[in-house]
């Protein structure tokens, strides 16, 4: 349904508050270095313009596309070339190339200062003095650091952020009330950002078909009672929503997401019995709740898959008539029966099935050729099962920090060319799979673990893509979306790597380490561990563990010393010399 003015249509659908918030997110995700005040000014100008279009859809420029309007506005920024360099060249292009150009310049790792949390009293004062600016600043700071954050979900986070301050700034112990809530929002926000980043990578690097396959598998697990046609409709709509958000079309995305939530709630009976509570909530909470809803119970007495997909004489006929529909049905049927499998495993099985049909339907006796296709699934299922079992045992034996360290060593030896901060960040996140998933019973471990690992390995892939340094990482990241994790798992020590030259500065520590939080201190130690492996890739696990224990003893000693800085300087030299002597650094 065409509208005379797209901007007026979205303003009316979303309301002024959401319109302004979403435009701010869009602008901050494109121009990540611009000051807050500049973005607020641009957003206010766009909003005033939108209001004129609501009043008269035939007014000048109201018929322009949102990309044209927003792009023109972004291109008015005076400091575009000096701040963003070649991104300024985007402004010489016409739509849709201009928007594509802006999208290509989104930076997953922008050079922005770490967000430091002020004192609680300072935050509460700022919140009370100007609530609107305080909340806008939150949207701005998150959006510019996470340029693919799912915009309608960021509105939900902002609503929770506001609620936390509203409640806690009146509490007797403000800090005890507020800080745990902010920690939770921060951790959930990072996880949400990473999950959305994988969706966008899936769409942008592997195409709509890959995303749709993922969505069919996931929604079939979640809604196993829904008919295939219903799941297909949801997949089509969900794909549109995520395509829009990943493409910077945040107003359309938020609007369509609201429509999808409305549709799901109006059709609960044919979708899932688990949606009742979600559908009683207000819009933002409702959409979030639906996205996180638990899997419905599987229908009783589902027939064997073999009948339709192996034993039937019509397999090749059905496949030839509509390949993607037939494969989609296979994926739907398999996924709804297997909530215990990861989505990526289900996609591997579907790919194996597709490859077998491609080969066998051209053979002399197709049925004879594909009769044993399900036997090919067994090793594909067992591989992640065994890997998860081994790693959960290791996690339970070591605890999270030391499990992370084991992964740090493992991944640094696999891809030593990758930057140390990236290896630390990714390995720490890989290590969190233990606490997140190993507590679950067998039936929930694989979907938890392997789908989480897909999200984390995508972080590695997008960070590496910005500055490619390893052919092995590029290969694992680009060859197959669903085989990324097995590809990285299969990597052995990189024997071609020339050890990094020793640099004493890398191993120089100062008294500031004593005042760091436990998490920050761990990151310092893990950074040293990665550097150690890069210098000495042949060091044994035992040697590395022993050197790290020396490091811990050194830090503990100097943090207890009266003259800490002198201790770090003198004892640090001794530690480096001792490690050099022992490892031949």
């Amino acid at each position: 349904d065409a509208h005379k003015s797209e901007v007026a249509h979205r303003f009316k659908d979303l309301g002024e508050e959401n319109f302004k918030a979403l435009v701010l997110i869009a602008f901050a995700q494109y121009l990540q270095q611009c000051p807050f005040e500049d973005h607020v000014k641009l957003v206010n100008e766009v909003t005033e313009f939108a209001k004129t279009c609501v009043a008269d859809e035939s007014a000048e420029n109201c018929d322009k596309s949102l990309h044209t309007l927003f792009g023109d506005k972004l291109c008015t920024v005076a400091t575009l070339r000096e701040t963003y360099g070649e991104m300024a060249d985007c402004c010489a292009k016409q739509e849709p190339e201009r928007n594509e150009c802006f999208l290509q310049h989104k930076d997953d790792n922008p050079n922005l200062p770490r967000l430091v949390r002020p004192e609680v009293d300072v935050m509460c004062t700022a919140f009370h003095d100007n609530e609107e600016t305080f909340l806008k600043k939150y949207l701005y700071e998150i959006a510019r650091r996470h340029p693919y954050f799912y915009a309608p979900e960021l509105l939900f986070f902002a609503k929770r952020y506001k609620a936390a301050f509203t409640e806690c700034c009146q509490a007797a112990d403000k800090a005890a009330c507020l800080l745990p809530k902010l920690d939770e929002l921060r951790d959930e926000g990072k996880a949400s950002s990473a999950k959305q980043r994988l969706k966008c990578a899936s769409l942008q690097k592997f195409g709509e078909r890959a995303f749709k396959a993922w969505a069919v598998a996931r929604l079939s697990q979640r809604f196993p009672k829904a008919e295939f046609a219903e799941v297909s409709k949801l997949v089509t709509d969900l794909t549109k929503v995520h395509t829009e958000c990943c493409h910077g079309d945040l107003l359309e995305c938020a609007d369509d997401r609201a429509d999808l939530a409305k549709y799901i709630c109006e059709n609960q009976d044919s979708i899932s019995s688990k949606l009742k509570e979600c559908c009683e909530k207000p819009l933002l909470e409702k959409s979030h709740c639906i996205a996180e809803v638990e899997n419905d119970e599987m229908p009783a007495d589902l027939p064997s898959l073999a009948a339709d997909f192996v034993e039937s004489k019509d397999v090749c006929k059905n496949y030839a008539e509509a390949k993607d529909v037939f494969l989609g049905m296979f994926l739907y049927e398999y996924a709804r029966r297997h909530p215990d499998y990861s989505v990526v495993l289900l996609l591997r099985l579907a790919k194996t099935y597709e490859t077998t049909l491609e080969k066998c339907c051209a053979a002399a006796d197709p049925h004879e050729c594909y009769a044993k296709v399900f036997d090919e699934f067994k090793p594909l299922v067992e591989e992640p099962q065994n890997l998860i079992k081994q790693n959960c045992e290791l996690f339970e034996q070591l605890g999270e920090y030391k499990f992370q360290n084991a992964l740090l060593v493992r991944y640094t030896k696999k891809v030593p060319q990758v930057s140390t901060p990236t290896l630390v960040e990714v390995s720490r996140n890989l290590g969190k799979v233990g606490s997140k998933c190993c507590k679950h019973p067998e039936a929930k471990r694989m979907p938890c673990a392997e789908d989480y690992l897909s999200v984390v390995l995508n972080q590695l892939c997008v960070l590496h893509e910005k500055t490619p340094v390893s052919d092995r990482v590029t290969k694992c990241c680009t060859e197959s979306l669903v085989n990324r994790r097995p590809c990285f798992s299969a990597l052995e020590v990189d024997e071609t790597y020339v050890p990094k030259e020793f640099n004493a500065e890398t191993f120089t520590f100062h008294a500031d380490i004593c005042t760091l939080s436990e998490k920050e201190r761990q990151i310092k130690k893990q950074t040293a561990l990665v550097e150690l492996v890069k210098h000495k890739p042949k060091a044994t696990k035992e040697q590395l563990k022993a050197v790290m224990d020396d490091f811990a003893a050194f830090v503990e000693k100097c943090c207890k010393a009266d003259d800490k800085e002198t201790c770090f300087a003198e004892e640090g030299k001794k530690l480096v010399a001792a490690s050099q002597a022992a490892l031949g650094l």
């Epitope: 001794k574 001792a578 022992a582």
Partner: nanobody, 124 residues
Framework: QVQLVESGGGLVQAGDSLRLSCAAS????????MGWFRQAPGKEREFVAR????????YYADSVKGRFTGSRDNAKNTVYLQMNSLKPEDTAVYYC?????????????????WGQGTQVTVSS
Amino acid sequence: QVQLVESGGGLVQAGDSLRLSCAASGRTFSDYAMGWFRQAPGKEREFVARINWSGTLTYYADSVKGRFTGSRDNAKNTVYLQMNSLKPEDTAVYYCAQRGDSGSNYDPSGYSYWGQGTQVTVSS
């Protein structure tokens, strides 16, 4: 199972020297730091020295710094504590211990395996 056996203790005059030895068997000796601790009657067990896995880095308690020297011979699975200029306040049972997988390097709780101890008595 790890076994640690100390030897070399005895009764000496103030100002004299003693050399304690600790022979280890069990898990790979060279993978772990070793510690020397002591316990005087009616007192807590206290840290004396830590000798790292390769013998290239040693940390001491302030009370023994400059008088005691820790060393190890990984080929012989043995760790040593050379004690010079002994004082009456050094009187205690001396224990050698093998580092555990976690905890403080300067606290008994950070060490997993212990010897039975050897008595050192310094008379004035």
